[in-house]
Amino acid sequence: TQHGIRLPLRSGLGGAPLGLRLPRETDEEPEEPGRRGSFVEMVDNLRGKSGQGYYVEMTVGSPPQTLNILVDTGSSNFAVGAAPHPFLHRYYQRQLSSTYRDLRKGVYVPYTQGKWEGELGTDLVSIPHGPNVTVRANIAAITESDKFFINGSNWEGILGLAYAEIARPDDSLEPFFDSLVKQTHVPNLFSLQLCGAGFPLNQSEVLASVGGSMIIGGIDHSLYTGSLWYTPIRREWYYEVIIVRVEINGQDLKMDCKEYNYDKSIVDSGTTNLRLPKKVFEAAVKSIKAASSTEKFPDGFWLGEQLVCWQAGTTPWNIFPVISLYLMGEVTNQSFRITILPQQYLRPVEDVATSQDDCYKFAISQSSTGTVMGAVIMEGFYVVFDRARKRIGFAVSACHVHDEFRTAAVEGPFVTLDMEDCGYNIPQTDESTLMTGRA
């Protein structure tokens, strides 16, 4: 997970769903028992802070040591602070755990900006507000880091929920979720509802508020409205998907769809922004600027650097367009679209705004490693990571921030031909370099 460029995200209380819940599709596939319904004990188990990550409480070792762990679908290591650090309130003390086993192996993870390194071991792990199970999992005990932990973020480790292929030091290190599924009866699926606040939260508000839900092993009906639409996981490394079309306020960007997925498109809860390949970013910003041309914003705003402020309560949401991403559907030549609002891609910034002002950063940015559907996307939706069926589901989140005129949407089906051609095939020789620094 890349801090600096790939900063973890923002969280907090979301607005209530707009209008009544839409009826379910009648032809929805039946699910195996236990995978749907109510998961009361897991609802609201995430907390977080603006731009700094959504975290879940976990316990490690015997007796259990409680730590807050960043939920990251863009990496595959379970790694926790295991030595004193100025930004950590607490850390994993292996010497106090009777069940810790040393693997006598080191791990080093560099990012484009920053790094962490540590020692591999295994220990007993559980999630208090998760399934009632304990698993023996691989743990990277972080002994040294640079620009990884974030001051005031309130998390002490990271839970990489992606696949073994991108685990460090190599794919032989079983990720936590694989261990969980192998050792228990928990179904091979989890779902995330990340709730953006729509306004900045101070530290005490964050600790008192809901950041969202991670439902392990199932889908909770109360967390979404309308229907779930699924897109195939193209390859099990990151949660890679295929985008087949992009629209700004209903206007097609009209690019070769390969550009949208160059060199990949992933769903990543550990990234704040919607990150787009250079050409796509430039086209999207040009289109967003044109749609909001009654007002002109500084160049630095579009670079995600300068903040634009409005008098409290007067943010002109209506001048900013909605953004739709069309994703490959499960049926041949069928796609569906997910639509986000400016309430998702303009990120409220704390510390700068006064009670007189609401200040925002533009949360769409340029990427050199493909499209990253970070919090900007995920905060609009309930996202189901259905690993068992190699697919990712999207439905409108019951906690997404919106206004009285527009709401986020998941709609389909749409006819789209030759969607397989939209995927980019990464040359084998490039992969090792791609994975060391996700810019």
Epitope: S293, T294, E295, K296, F297, P298, D299, G300, F301, E305, Q306, L307, V308, C309, D351, V352, D357, C359
Partner: antibody
Framework: QLQLQESGPGLVKPSETLSLTCTVS??????????WGWIRQPPGKGLEWIGM???????WYNPSLKSRVTISVDTSKNQFSLKLSSVTAADTAVYYC????????????WGRGTLVTVSS | EIVLTQSPATLSLSPGERATLSCRAS??????LAWYQQKPGQAPRLLIY???KRATGIPARFSGSGSGTDFTLTISSLEPEDFAVYYC??????????FGGGTKVEIK
């Protein structure tokens, strides 16, 4: 080259409305690259941003003055104007009009300024 | 709200000397900071923008540095026409409404 020139009465009575106009010459006010703003400076004091306008008519105001300020644009005359209502002696200042350029962030070109005194 | 504090309030120097003016922001403003020069009876003039970029027509003896919260305007060798008041302005938060209180550079 582009120049800005403020004009308007130099003396305004308390409780009345201060009205100033800035005429842009040597270039078009309708350029999509710029905002046009007003800044004031009380005698012997620092600079205070009043507000600014885009050629489309979109405006931004200093919250501390917002209830009393109106900035408008007349693209046909290549002018933009400032109205400040219910003035008091505290509004006595040199009023400058300026162009906001360099990526729409900095005041890169200023008028000479005009002193407005509020007195009965 | 971001507050800009300039120091010193007054700097007394002789022509040919080096002038170092400071501007401190209450929070990080990245590199979104400008410096203006104002001579008596004249309008301010943009000297430096983006913390370190010289505006058109500004002599090379003027230089800006810094990022985050601490910024410096340096005049390498004071010319008689450089004695004036200097203001910093942050535009990290937009619209660009925050100026510092000013530093007066006077002849010693």
């Amino acid at each position: 080259q582009l120049q800005l020139q403020e004009s308007g009465p130099g003396l305004v009575k308390p409780s009345e409305t201060l009205s100033l106009t800035c005429t842009v010459s040597g270039g078009s006010i309708s350029s999509s690259s710029y905002y046009w703003g007003w800044i004031r400076q009380p005698p012997g004091k620092g600079l205070e941003w009043i507000g600014m306008i885009y050629y489309s008519g979109s405006t931004w105001y200093n919250p501390s003055l917002k209830s009393r300020v109106t900035i408008s644009v007349d693209t046909s005359k290549n002018q933009f104007s400032l109205k400040l209502s219910s003035v008091t002696a505290a509004d006595t200042a040199v009023y400058y009009c300026a162009r906001v350029g360099h990526g729409v962030s900095y005041f890169d070109l200023w008028g000479r300024g005009t002193l407005v005194t509020v007195s009965s | 709200e971001i507050v800009l504090t300039q120091s010193p309030a007054t700097l007394s120097l002789s022509p040919g000397e080096r002038a170092t003016l400071s501007c401190r922001a209450s929070q990080s403003v990245s590199s979104y900071l400008a410096w203006y020069q104002q001579k008596p009876g004249q309008a301010p003039r943009l000297l430096i923008y983006g913390a370190s970029k010289r505006a058109t027509g500004i002599p090379a003896r003027f230089s800006g540095s810094g990022s985050g919260t601490d910024f410096t305007l340096t005049i390498s060798s004071l010319e008689p026409e450089d004695f004036a008041v200097y203001y910093c302005q942050q535009v990290y938060t937009w619209p660009p409404r925050t100026f510092g209180g000013g530093t007066k550079v006077e002849i010693k």
